[in-house]
C-alpha cells in the first residue's frame, strides 16, 4: 500500500509535471508566437484512456514528437529549451509510470493538435492530483 | 516592487561545495511566466550565466557548468538556491541572482545585490 | 557556442552621442532578442534595453537599440551623454542551449 510519503512525492511529482506542460501551453498560446498556425498542423497521438500513471506511457511514446515540433516552433518570441524542458518533462514522466511493469498504450482513432495534446494532459495531471489530495 | 537578495557563506574551501540561497520578497516565485537565475561576475571581468529553474522545479544549465552545478527551489519559502560542487580559485566571484522570463528570450530583471564567494583555503 | 564581441572602452564628452557595438559570431544576431544592461561600480547590472530595442520603465529615452543583420551585429546608443552615464556596459543573447554576455564596454565621460 503507498505510504503517505510516497503519495506526497507523487502528487508533488505530478505538480511539477503539470506547471511544465502549462508554461509550454501558456507559450503556444501567447499572443505573440507567428508560428502558432503551422503548430497547429502537427498532429499528436491521444489515449484511449488515460485514468492511472501507468497510462503516461502514452505522454512518454510522444515527447519526442512533441520536441520536434517545439524545436520547429523556435522564433524571437516562442524561445523554449526543448531538449533540456523534454528531458526535465521525461524524467518525471519515468519516475511516475514506474519500470516494474510494461504497458502497451492504447491510442485512440482520432489524433489532435498540440494544444488539444496538451490539455488532455494537462486534465490528467490535475484529476490523478485531486484523487491524491 | 520585486527584490531578490543572496545570502551564503563568503568563504568557500577549494574541492568543497559553494552553497547560496536567494530570497524572493515583493513577488512570488510561484506565480508562473518566469524563471529564476543564477549569474556570476568574476572579479574585474565578465558577466557569466550559471543557470535557471521553473517553478515546478525543471532546471537549465550552462553547458560548461553542468557537471557540477545544482539548483533548486522552494516555494514555500519563496527562495531558490545553487550548489556550485568542487570548487577552485576559479570559481572566485560575485554571484548574482536574477528573474527570466519564460517564453519570450532569456534576460535578466531585476538583479540581486550580489554577494562575493571567494574560494580559498 | 557563440560569442559576443564588444569594445573593451569608449569615451565622449557631456552632451555627445556615444554607440556601443556588440558582435556576434555565428549564428544570426536577428535570431534571438539582445540584451544591453548598465553596471556602475559597485553595483549590480540593471537593464537599459531589452528584446533588441525596448526601454524598461525608467530609463530615459536617450538609450536606444538597434539589430544591423548586414554586420551581425547590436548596436546601444545613448544620445545627451550625461556624466552619470559613465558605467560599463554589456549586451547578452542566447540560443536554444546557452546564454551569453559580451566581455562589457566601459564608457568614460570625458571632462
Known amino acids: 500500500a503507498p505510504t503517505s510519503s510516497s503519495t506526497k512525492k507523487t502528487q508533488l511529482q505530478l505538480e511539477h509535471l503539470l506547471l511544465d506542460l502549462q508554461m509550454i501551453l501558456n507559450g503556444i498560446n501567447n499572443y505573440k508566437n507567428p508560428k502558432l498556425t503551422r503548430m497547429l498542423t502537427f498532429k499528436f497521438y491521444m489515449p484511449k484512456k488515460a485514468t492511472e500513471l501507468k497510462h503516461l506511457q502514452c505522454l512518454e511514446e510522444e515527447l519526442k514528437p512533441l520536441e520536434e515540433v517545439l524545436n520547429l516552433a523556435q522564433s524571437k518570441n516562442f524561445h523554449l529549451r526543448p531538449r533540456d524542458l523534454i528531458s526535465n518533462i521525461n524524467v518525471i514522466v519515468l519516475e511516475l509510470k514506474g519500470s516494474e511493469t510494461t504497458f502497451m498504450c492504447e491510442y485512440a482513432d482520432e489524433t489532435a493538435t498540440i494544444v488539444e495534446f496538451l490539455n488532455r494532459w494537462i486534465t490528467f495531471c490535475q484529476s490523478i492530483i485531486s484523487t491524491l489530495t | 516592487q520585486l527584490q531578490l537578495q543572496e545570502s551564503g557563506p563568503g568563504l568557500v574551501k577549494p574541492s568543497q561545495t559553494l552553497s547560496l540561497t536567494c530570497t524572493v520578497s515583493?513577488?512570488?516565485?510561484?506565480?508562473?511566466?518566469?524563471?529564476w537565475s543564477w549569474i556570476r561576475q568574476h572579479p574585474g571581468k565578465g558577466l557569466e550565466w550559471i543557470g535557471y529553474?521553473?517553478?515546478?522545479?525543471?532546471?537549465y544549465y550552462n553547458p560548461s557548468l553542468k557537471s557540477r552545478v545544482t539548483i533548486s527551489v522552494d516555494t514555500s519559502k519563496n527562495q531558490f538556491s545553487l550548489k556550485l560542487s568542487n570548487v577552485t580559485a576559479a570559481d572566485t566571484a560575485v554571484y548574482y541572482c536574477?528573474?527570466?522570463?519564460?517564453?519570450?528570450?532569456?534576460?535578466?530583471?531585476?538583479w540581486g545585490r550580489g554577494t562575493l564567494v571567494t574560494v580559498s583555503s | 557556442n557563440f560569442m559576443l564581441t564588444q569594445p573593451h572602452s569608449v569615451s565622449e564628452s557631456p552632451g555627445k552621442t556615444v554607440t556601443i557595438s556588440c558582435t556576434r559570431s555565428?549564428?544570426?544576431?536577428?535570431?534571438?532578442?539582445v540584451q544591453w544592461y548598465q553596471q556602475r561600480p559597485g553595483s549590480s547590472p540593471t537593464t537599459v534595453i531589452y528584446?533588441?530595442?525596448?526601454?524598461p520603465s525608467g530609463v530615459p529615452d536617450r538609450f536606444s537599440g538597434s539589430i544591423d543583420s548586414s554586420s551581425n551585429s547590436a548596436s546601444l546608443t545613448i544620445s545627451g551623454l550625461k556624466t552619470e552615464d559613465e558605467a560599463d556596459y554589456y549586451c547578452?543573447?542566447?540560443?536554444?542551449?546557452?546564454?551569453?554576455f559580451g566581455g562589457g564596454t566601459k564608457l568614460t565621460v570625458l571632462g
Open positions: 536574477a528573474r527570466t522570463p519564460t517564453v519570450t528570450g532569456d534576460w535578466f530583471d531585476p
Open positions: 515583493g513577488g512570488s516565485i510561484s506565480s508562473g511566466g518566469y524563471y
Open positions: 529553474i521553473y517553478y515546478s522545479g525543471s532546471t
Open positions: 555565428s549564428g544570426s544576431i536577428a535570431s534571438n532578442y
Open positions: 528584446e533588441d530595442n525596448q526601454r
Open positions: 547578452q543573447s542566447y540560443d536554444s542551449s546557452n546564454v551569453v
